[in-house]
């Protein structure tokens, strides 16, 4: 029950996180005009990964897309790539995790397969979250660097007569959305990995127990291994116990719900 809850919660948290990563990627407010010196501005600038916008006090807003690919800063391209990779991995992770959910029965899918899928989706969510956090952090670092550079030459003048005020940019709402969303996706991924361990506990190393029946000694080994007779190879009396449809050369064998000792 706890495993199902952990898996379900991990899925929901990751879903919210990935929705947040998508929202952050699409948002225009990655960087917003710094209003420290002028809290009421007549023209307000803000920028996203895909376009830059200007909002006037009149309410008129105009956005312009970055219609160039080669002319954009490499850092911006890197951030775009990280966010897209994060979304793609997250989306695949969500798709995989839907089929991995314990509460959803798909044919005769084994718990071992569900465990593997849960682990796969968990890893995908972790990488997705890390991509988003990395992307947002790279952009934030870029902003901090530019902020202090523009502060250093805030006013450039012609003989001190005419002042050109440089527009400084600070953290936009999308950065915080991205950080939180990335964190949630990461947490969701970790929860999925924890749930995977619960779905697939390591094999219990029981000692082989001998049941002495009249005539023949049958050694019974749990966990899907073939039991053999105690003495010689009397095939007539050989019992095969296989809890599932697994082969005997599997590295690790997981007991199914039918496996009882």
């Amino acid at each position: 029950m706890a495993v199902t809850a952990c898996q379900g919660l991990g899925f929901v948290v990751s879903l919210i996180g990935i929705a947040g990563i998508i929202a952050a990627t699409c948002m225009d407010q990655w960087s917003t005009q710094d209003l420290y010196n002028n809290p009421v501005t007549a023209v307000f600038n803000y920028q996203g990964l895909w376009r830059s916008c200007v909002r006037e006090s009149s309410g008129f807003t105009e956005c312009r897309g970055y219609f160039t690919l080669l002319g954009l800063p490499a850092m911006l391209q890197a951030v775009r790539a990280l966010m897209i990779v994060g979304i793609v991995l997250g989306a695949i992770g969500l798709l995989v995790s839907i089929f991995a959910l314990k509460c959803i029965r798909i044919g005769s899918m084994e718990d071992s397969a569900k465990a593997n899928m849960t682990l796969t989706s968990g890893i995908m969510f972790i990488v997705s979250g890390l991509c988003a956090i990395a992307g947002v952090s790279v952009f934030a670092n870029m902003l901090v660097t530019n902020f202090w550079m523009s502060t250093a030459n805030m006013y450039t003048g012609m003989g001190g007569m005419v002042q050109t005020v440089q527009t400084r940019y600070t953290f936009g709402a999308a950065l915080f959305v991205g950080w939180v969303a990335g964190g949630l996706t990461l947490i969701g991924g970790v929860m999925m990995c924890i749930a995977c361990r619960g779905l697939a506990p390591e094999e219990t190393n029981y000692k082989a127990v001998s049941y002495h029946a009249s005539g023949h000694s049958v050694a019974y080994k749990p966990g899907g291994f073939k039991a053999s007779t105690g003495f010689g190879s009397n095939t007539k009396n050989k019992k095969i116990y296989d809890g599932g449809a697994r082969t005997e050369d599997e590295v690790q064998s997981y007991p199914s719900k039918h496996d009882y000792v």
Partner: antibody, heavy 118, light 113 residues
Framework: QIQLVQSGPELKKPGETVRISCKAS????????MQWVQKMPGKGLKWIGW????????NFAEDFKGRFAFSLETSARIAYLQISNIKNEDMATYFC???????????WGQGTSVTVSS | DIVMTQSPSSLTVTVGEKVTMSCKSS????????????LTWYQQKPGQPPKLLIY???TRESGVPDRFTGSGSETDFTLTISSLQAEDLAVYYC?????????FGGGTNLEIK
């Protein structure tokens, strides 16, 4: 069509309070800010300030902070300019103007003349 | 505050003549975000409220005759009337629309000979 109609001329004694109204029609009142401008006889235009008709937040030029106040009657689509403790130097024509694209004053009221006489 | 300086303060011209008036700002009115200059021109005829002529330094307001042209960038702006008409007798004001307070220039008074 968009129209801004201001109240009639005012004659006030120093120290009194005057309230000028500006009734808007032809557009959604809360979608555009309202600005106020002072025109003194023989002088140029002076920007008093503006009020965000949606958030009701005012913004004044430094020279007009204190005795000047903006208010709104949103349901009636009216903006008000109130000048308290009126002085001789407040004698002017006051215009209301809609805040338009490019932070301009795209539509103007006809103006309200305020005379201060003891 | 941004200081707007207009020149000349008064101009006497004849009908049909080309007229140019200047407006200078103490700070750049160019917004880097959209590469627009937030400079507005108004025309005020005697006994009337001002009328919007040009915004964003060069964009003509609808209904304004094409003889009115705005130009310039950052701190230096010009309003040109290609062929003056009698009805253009007025005071012309430039205004900073970039930063609060939205300051006006002193005006250029256009008189007909």
């Amino acid at each position: 069509q968009i129209q801004l109609v201001q109240s009639g001329p005012e004659l006030k004694k120093p120290g009194e309070t005057v309230r000028i109204s500006c009734k808007a029609s032809g557009y959604t009142f809360t979608t555009a800010g309202m600005q106020w401008v002072q025109k003194m006889p023989g002088k140029g235009l002076k920007w008093i300030g503006w009020i965000n008709t949606h958030s009701r937040v005012p913004n004044f030029a430094e020279d007009f902070k204190g005795r000047f106040a903006f208010s709104l009657e949103t349901s009636a689509r009216i903006a008000y300019l109130q000048i308290s403790n009126i002085k001789n130097e407040d004698m002017a024509t006051y215009f209301c103007a809609r805040l338009g694209k490019g932070n301009t004053m795209d539509f103007w009221g006809q103006g309200t003349s305020v005379t201060v006489s003891s | 505050d941004i200081v707007m300086t207009q020149s000349p303060s008064s101009l006497t011209v004849t009908v049909g003549e080309k007229v140019t008036m200047s407006c200078k700002s103490s700070q750049s009115l160019l917004n880097s975000g959209n590469q627009k200059n937030y400079l507005t021109w108004y025309q005020q005829k005697p006994g009337q409220p001002p009328k919007l002529l040009i915004y964003w330094a060069s964009t003509r307001e609808s209904g304004v005759p094409d003889r009115f042209t705005g130009s310039g960038s950052e701190t230096d702006f010009t309003l040109t009337i290609s062929s003056l008409q009698a009805e253009d007798l007025a005071v012309y004001y430039c205004q900073n629309s970039y930063s609060f307070p939205l300051t006006f220039g002193g005006g250029t008074n256009l008189e007909i000979k």
